[in-house]
């Protein structure tokens, strides 16, 4: 990002307001909604992105079967509470004092309760399974080419360390990308798998969060990879706590 006032922008987050008013005249960008300063050399946290969105005008090739504890984000958009580091607060509440506990990617992991609900810690999502269905093509993609292209995408576009892309599975037309990142593995400066998955999800939907970059143009050996359905499963280090009522529903 550049100091010249007209070019002071955040390449990794277009939902920001930037000005060269940082220390020494540094270009400093703040997320819409929260007003928190963001580091434009890396991905912005999902919590700040959701908050900004709410503030804006209205190796085996076998596919993975998500575990019984896998969470899907069925609740959709909400205006989250973020901590000073931009992470989700463990407890989230809406305007009607309905509260619930979330994991590190902001997905609800308990039944909804009232203001007396306690969420002792922010439970880390250490395994993310991105399940994609691609549009029909003349033939199946070559698995190793597809694997290489998706790994390159996560490394270059989302700056996610290659070691966190655990596997890419393919059984036409279904592609699954497994991201794994334990608390102990994540070093300072590492992109969080939850943030990378969110940027990818928005890219796939044609809602890129990057400033001024074209939308995602995924190609495998020159052949366009067009996604028609996306499902993301989240696995936490501690299994979620839902009542039997929900589990049998």
């Amino acid at each position: 990002h550049t100091a010249a006032q007209d070019n002071c922008t955040c390449p990794t987050n277009k939902m920001t307001v930037c000005s060269p008013d940082g220390p020494g005249g540094r270009c400093q960008c703040r997320a819409l909604g929260s007003g928190m300063a963001v580091d434009c050399s890396t991905l912005t946290s999902k919590c700040l992105l959701l908050k900004a969105r709410m503030s804006a005008p209205k190796n085996a090739r076998t596919l993975v079967r998500p575990s019984e504890h896998a969470l899907v984000d069925n609740d959709g958009l909400y205006d989250p509470d973020c901590d000073p580091e931009g992470r989700f607060k463990a407890r989230q509440c809406n305007q009607t004092s309905v509260c619930w506990c979330v994991n590190s990617v902001g997905v609800r992991r308990t039944d909804k309760g009232d203001l007396s609900l306690r969420c002792d810690e922010l439970v880390r999502t250490h395994h993310i399974l991105i399940d994609l269905r691609h549009r029909p093509t003349a033939g199946a993609f070559n698995h190793s080419d597809l694997d290489a292209e998706l790994r390159r995408l996560f490394r270059e576009r989302y700056r996610l360390h290659p070691k966190f892309v655990a596997a890419v599975h393919y059984e036409q037309p279904t592609i699954q990308i497994e991201l794994r990142q334990n608390t102990s593995q994540k070093a300072a400066g590492d992109v969080d798998i939850g943030d990378a998955a969110y940027y990818f999800e928005r890219d796939i939907k044609g809602e890129s969060l990057f400033q001024g970059r074209g939308g995602l143009d995924l190609r495998v050996r020159g052949e366009p990879l067009q996604v028609e359905r996306t499902l993301i499963y989240y696995l936490d280090e501690i299994p979620p706590k839902f009542s039997m009522k929900r589990l049998t529903a």
């Epitope: 990002h1 550049t2 100091a3 010249a4 006032q5 007209d6 002071c8 000005s19 060269p20 008013d21 940082g22 220390p23 020494g24 005249g25 540094r26 270009c27 580091d39 050399s41």
Partner: antibody
């Protein structure tokens, strides 16, 4: 080419004020902030403050708060640094500096420096 | 305020030598660190910004590394014009601060 040209050396008495100018050329003045840094003889560099000429926003080091005022005149592409209640410890070379184009808070263009001597 | 501590305070070396200067911040500053070279009677000259990016026109013998609290400036092969004083500077938070300087002298 891009440059910052500062006013000449000054000799002042304790308690007086000094106003140093810094004229920018070779770039759009209002597109970049201006920082002021001083250096006493044989000592290190000390940041005093900064101004964004377009917004008028300023920031000063706590040490100089209340004694330093940074202003700018867009019509002449000139920045000014005024230091009041001068004391002998203020004897130093005063530099103006522009942040780099990369927006990283590093200073890529510096003035030649203005020697300010405070002596009774 | 963030304190920057440079080491060594002074170093003697010869032309062609490899020299490393370190700068330690009192708290994390991400990669918001710059390095300057200053010759007597002259204004400082920017060498490295954002901890490791080489300023345009600066010879490739200069390199920077580090992030967080520990940073390094390396001169791979000293040239006569490199004998000067070197400063690190942080732009992570107000106020901007400089290290105390490292004097590089001819052995």
């Amino acid at each position: 080419q891009v440059q910052l040209v500062q006013s000449g050396a000054e000799v002042k008495k304790p308690g007086a004020s000094v106003k140093v100018s810094c004229k920018a050329s070779g770039y759009t003045f209002t597109n970049y902030g201006i920082n002021w840094v001083r250096q006493a003889t044989g000592r290190g560099l000390e940041w005093m403050g900064w101004m964004n000429p377009r917004s008028g926003n300023t920031g000063y080091a706590q040490k100089f708060q209340g004694r330093v005022t940074i202003t700018a005149d867009e019509s002449t592409s000139t920045a000014y640094m005024e230091l009041s209640s001068l004391r002998s410890e203020d004897t130093a070379v005063y530099y103006c500096a522009r942040p780099n184009t990369g927006g990283d808070g590093a200073f890529d263009i510096w003035g030649q420096g203005t020697m300010v001597t405070v002596s009774s | 305020d963030i304190q920057l501590t440079q080491s060594p305070s002074s170093v003697s070396a010869s032309v062609g030598d490899r020299v490393t200067i370190t700068c330690r911040a009192s708290q994390g500053i991400k990669s918001w660190l710059a390095w300057y070279r200053q010759k007597p009677g002259k204004a400082p000259k920017l060498l490295i910004y954002r901890a490791h990016s080489l300023q345009s026109g600066v010879p490739s013998r200069f390199s920077g590394s580090g992030s967080g609290t520990d940073f390094t400036l390396t001169i791979s092969s000293l040239q006569p014009e490199d004998f000067a004083t070197y400063y690190c500077q942080q732009a992570n938070s107000f106020p901007v601060t400089f290290g105390q300087g490292t004097r590089l002298e001819i052995k």
